[in-house]
């Protein structure tokens, strides 16, 4: 007894087509690319049917149903909008995903297509949703502003500008991603195995101001070539925080220097840098405080600090910035926070120095500043990131 | 983002009916037109799918339990539930309630409750 | 209805590969799912459709499936890999779980 003859579902046809099918002949059922099998609602690889000796088919005709995505991913500090039309997600379907503008960027056109494999994907054929990446070096804060010998900041000129507080110790840091902060090696060497002790506080201009974002470290990493107690080459740290930082006009990371950022950081450019620590009345800043000052002469600086502490070096790793008169410096407890320089090209701030040592004596004359050099250490940081 | 609860009593006699109902949040039942499921997993054992119901209400149910059990759905409370009739000792198992990955698709469970434990026991 | 038969357990040291097998009559005809279930927690889909990874999934863990046995492959295993896994496939219209194998990861 012959089977009936199958008849193809939608959007399928069935191989081989015979004019009768008998006792052991078997079809299979494809579908147009863009469909797959299903037969009870479950998501089939292939399809074979056999003619059976009393004449019926083995299995029932599936049918080939239209692909879906499904709902595309969430994307943090972003949102996606459906472009073929509302909720739809099947095949062809188009999406597309943006950030908060101002505050995040993608590096993708961030448009995607419910491909045949059952996945989202971009015109460069990545399957993952794209990343919403904080902006960088963003701020209100221009050059010529008149710490020791500095100014009040405005809310929005330094919105990496972090506190670092320990049980007695204050120190500071620059947010470099929304959830990473660099700062210097001394500041947080005796935290690096309690990282939870440090408590760390941003988006505030009051160094007491109720008003703050908490985070709190996962990890601190301490480069390792930074020898705690003797001298400060390497005075640099990197401190993971639990969560990320939720990026806005008080809170943004400042951006990391490019390749060609040395010839920024010339002798005599003007950086920028703030703090909660002394002031020339010798106490803490309350609120943050900031100076723009000149990067100093490399070699003048070293012959400054032979003489003034033999056996302390100035070595490549560190930058100088301060006025040969004096009267303008970063002082006790403003260590880890960043001299920022503004990129003429981008017109974005970028970390070029990190605060790290000096004369007792800040702000005094032919007695400079010391700060880690930040493009030396560009690798490291890279490093630190990716990994962790 | 979808959550799910399962509810009912932790214990139950032998011969009586084990009901368990999953509270859906975060979502709809019948916005998505998914497929939702019951597993369960007696003590110190493997995995036992028991059944699947659609959001419209068709039911598909493992043979080896299909005499015994009803899966319905209750879009009005968001809720989807599970009875197992005539329960013995070896119905004594965390019961999960999860939902498939694609819409319309008995694929596989993306999204599971915490499960609840049900003791068969006088 | 097919029987889906694991092994009871697969050990492996750090950073290492771990392969998890799942045999059953012409399973390379259906497709295989695995999912993860940690100690006291509900089970995660890890890969579902024999490679496919939902978001969410670290790359390390990779699928396939062909002939009558699905392997589910850790590579580069970590000690949060620890845990049982199961294999699961639908054979006409039921869903049928493997026993499970649990993963220890030495050191």
């Known amino acids: 007894r012959p089977c009936p003859d199958p008849t193809a579902p939608p959007n399928g046809s069935i191989s081989p087509v015979q004019a009768i099918y008998v006792l052991k002949d078997r079809f299979s059922v494809f579908c147009k690319t863009g469909f797959e099998l299903l037969q009870g609602s479950v998501p089939l690889k292939s399809f074979t049917a056999v003619c059976q000796k009393d004449g019926s088919w083995d299995r029932p005709m599936p049918e080939c149903s239209i692909i879906d995505c499904g709902p595309p991913d969430d994307l943090p500090n972003g949102h996606v909008d459906y472009i073929t039309g509302p909720e739809v997600t099947t095949y062809k379907a188009v999406i597309q995903y943006s950030c908060e503008e101002t505050f995040y960027t993608m590096s993708s056109n961030g448009k995607y297509v419910c491909e045949a494999d059952g996945f989202w994907t971009s015109s460069k054929g990545e399957k993952l949703p794209p990343v919403c990446e904080p902006v960088c070096g963003l701020s209100t804060h221009t050059i010529g502003g008149r710490i020791v010998g500095g100014q009040p900041a405005k809310p929005g000129d330094f919105p990496w500008q972090v506190l670092l507080l320990g049980q007695t110790t204050a120190a500071a840091g620059a947010l470099i991603h929304d959830n990473w902060v660099l700062t210097a090696a001394h500041a947080v060497y005796e935290k690096r195995m309690a990282a939870s002790s440090l408590n760390i506080r941003m988006g505030i201009l009051k160094r007491l101001s109720p008003h703050y974002t908490q985070a709190w470290p996962e990890e601190i990493f301490i480069h390792e070539g930074y020898t705690h107690g003797a001298g400060f080459d390497n005075d640099i740290a990197l401190i993971k925080l639990k969560n990320k930082v939720t990026i806005n006009g008080s809170i943004m990371p400042v951006c990391l220097p490019r390749k060609e950022a040395a010839s920024l950081m010339r002798t005599d450019f003007t950086g920028t840098v703030a703090g909660w620590g002394l002031t020339q009345k010798g106490l803490l800043a309350r609120n943050l405080m900031f100076v723009d000052i000149p990067i100093a002469d490399h070699q003048k600086c070293t012959a400054v600090y032979e003489k003034l502490y033999p056996g302390v070096r100035v070595s490549a790793n560190m930058l100088c910035a301060g006025l040969e008169t004096g009267g303008k410096d970063s002082c006790r407890g403003d260590a880890g926070g960043a001299l920022v320089f503004l990129d003429n090209e981008t017109q974005r701030w970028f970390v070029g120095g990190i605060v790290s040592w000096g004369s007792i004596n800040c702000g005094a004359a032919d007695q400079y500043g010391v700060y880690t050099k930040v493009i030396n250490y560009i690798p490291w940081i890279e490093n630190i990131i990716s990994n962790f | 983002q979808v959550q799910l609860q399962e509810s009912g009593p932790g214990l139950v006699k032998p011969s009586e009916t084990l009901s368990l109902t999953c509270t859906v949040s975060?979502?709809?039942?019948?916005?998505?037109?998914?497929?939702w499921g019951w597993i369960r997993q007696p003590p110190g054992k493997g995995l036992e799918w028991i059944g699947s119901?659609?959001?419209?209400?068709?039911?598909y149910y493992n043979p080896s339990l299909k005499s015994r059990v009803t899966i319905s759905v209750d879009t009005s409370k968001n809720q989807f539930s599970l009875k197992l009739s005539s329960v013995t000792a070896a119905d004594t198992a965390v019961y999960y309630c999860?939902?498939?990955?694609?819409?319309?698709?008995?694929?596989?469970?993306?999204?599971w409750g915490q499960g609840t434990t049900v003791t068969v026991s006088s | 209805q097919s029987v889906l038969t694991q092994p009871p357990s697969v050990s492996v040291s750090p950073g290492q590969t771990a392969s998890i097998t799942c045999s059953g009559h012409?399973?390379?005809?259906?497709?295989a799912y695995w999912y993860q279930q940690k100690p006291g927690q509900s089970p995660v889909l890890v890969i579902y459709?024999?490679?496919k990874r939902p978001s969410g999934i670290p790359e390390r863990f990779s699928g396939f499936n062909s002939g009558n046995t699905a392997t589910l492959t850790i590579s580069g295993t970590q000690a949060t890999d620890e845990a049982d896994y199961y294999c699961?496939?639908?054979?006409?219209?039921?869903?049928?779980f493997g026993a499970g194998t649990k993963v220890t990861v030495l050191g």
């Open positions: 459709q024999d490679t």
């Open positions: 975060g979502g709809s039942i019948s916005s998505g037109e998914y497929f």
């Open positions: 999860a939902r498939s990955l694609k819409a319309a698709r008995r694929d596989a469970f993306d999204i």
């Open positions: 012409k399973l390379g005809d259906k497709y």
């Open positions: 119901i659609y959001y419209s209400g068709s039911t």
């Open positions: 699961q496939t639908w054979d006409s219209s039921t869903g049928v």
